[in-house]
Interface confidence: medium
Amino acid sequence: TIDTKRNISAEEGGSVILQCHFSSDTAEVTQVDWKQQDQLLAIYSVDLGWHVASVFSDRVVPGPSLGLTFQSLTMNDTGEYFCTYHTYPGGIYKGRIFLKVQESSDDRNGLAQFQTAPLG
């Protein structure tokens, strides 16, 4: 079975961990796909490790475990995310997460954000 948080929220500009937990007494995971709606984000393969779509390669970091860390979130990242676990024996298991990206608290409070960099 797949266990996941059905709905999660994160702030614009921040990051979020997308995680699906697969549990089985007999089946072993051979491959895991992550999709944003119909768009392929990344694949984990037991044989080949992680592959990340070039579309997302600057914002998606594999892990922790078989999850994904999605960085520099924008409002456009709001939507459904799907994990698909390919297992042997046992077949295919799917999980769904709805991510809601919200305006950052600073924006909501009407504050400007300033960043300072150390002098070098």
Partner: antibody
């Protein structure tokens, strides 16, 4: 919804240059590999080559001496030119979008070459006949 | 170049049958293997990528397996719209190469 629309001359004489263009409507142009594939009558599929938005191209060695694939990012278009055609180049020519993924190693995704994960959007095909 | 060999080259089956098509690579390609369906006069359609993974919108009766040099495409219960030609494609190295195709016909 991403769509590929292709066009070009359908009837050529031997020694002429085949010229086809494929326009990409919808979706991102920069994040994919843009591919040409052909299929001779009653035969299988043959990969001709591909190009990125930045103009980096890769060709099938069997055709490399005669092929040029170019890109026009201002129009979201890419083109195929095949020189000195013969009857053996008679085929249906398809443009397609190739999704590539980078193999991840620690904090970089550019250590390894990218790998195809399929051509998921195709043009309608253009029948090209070479005959004297 | 990596050679891809499909078997059988043609196959007759009935609606409801379980069908398996095999694809063999001339060298190991790990799981960099894709499957396409093509109907007469139409462009190919991506069914399965990375040996196992079903492309969005493709019915779950299609499944893929294999790694290394030997791969299979299985249709668990043939439907009338499944009669077509199927191609495997390796994406391990360029030039990208396809199998010669398997034509699936109605018995």
């Amino acid at each position: 919804q991403v769509q590929l629309q292709q066009w070009g001359a359908g009837l050529l004489k031997p020694s002429e240059t085949l010229s086809l263009t494929c326009a990409v409507y919808g979706g991102s142009f920069n994040d994919y590999y843009w591919t040409w594939i052909r299929q001779a009558p009653g035969k299988g599929l043959e990969w001709i080559g591909e190009i990125t938005h930045s103009g980096s191209a890769d060709y099938n060695p069997s055709l490399k001496s005669r092929v040029t694939i170019s890109v026009d990012t201002s129009k979201n278009q890419f083109s195929l030119k095949l020189r000195s055609v013969t009857a053996a180049d008679t085929a249906v020519y398809y443009c397609a979008r190739g999704l590539k993924l980078f193999r991840w190693k620690k904090t970089t995704v550019t250590t390894f070459p990218p790998y195809y994960y399929g051509m998921d959007v195709w043009g309608q095909g253009t029948t090209v006949t070479v005959s004297s | 170049d990596i050679q891809m060999t499909q078997s059988p080259s043609s196959l007759s089956a009935s609606v409801g049958d379980r069908v398996t098509i095999t694809c063999r690579a001339s060298q190991s390609i790990s799981s960099y293997l894709n499957w396409y369906q093509q109907k007469p006069g139409k462009a190919p359609k991506l069914l399965i990528y990375s040996a196992y993974s079903l492309q969005s919108g493709v019915p779950s009766r299609f499944s893929g397996s294999g790694s290394g040099t030997d791969f299979t495409l299985t249709i668990s219960s043939l439907q009338p719209e499944d009669f077509a030609t199927y191609y495997c494609q390796q994406s391990y190295s360029t030039p990208i190469t396809f199998g010669q195709g398997t034509r699936l016909e109605i018995k």
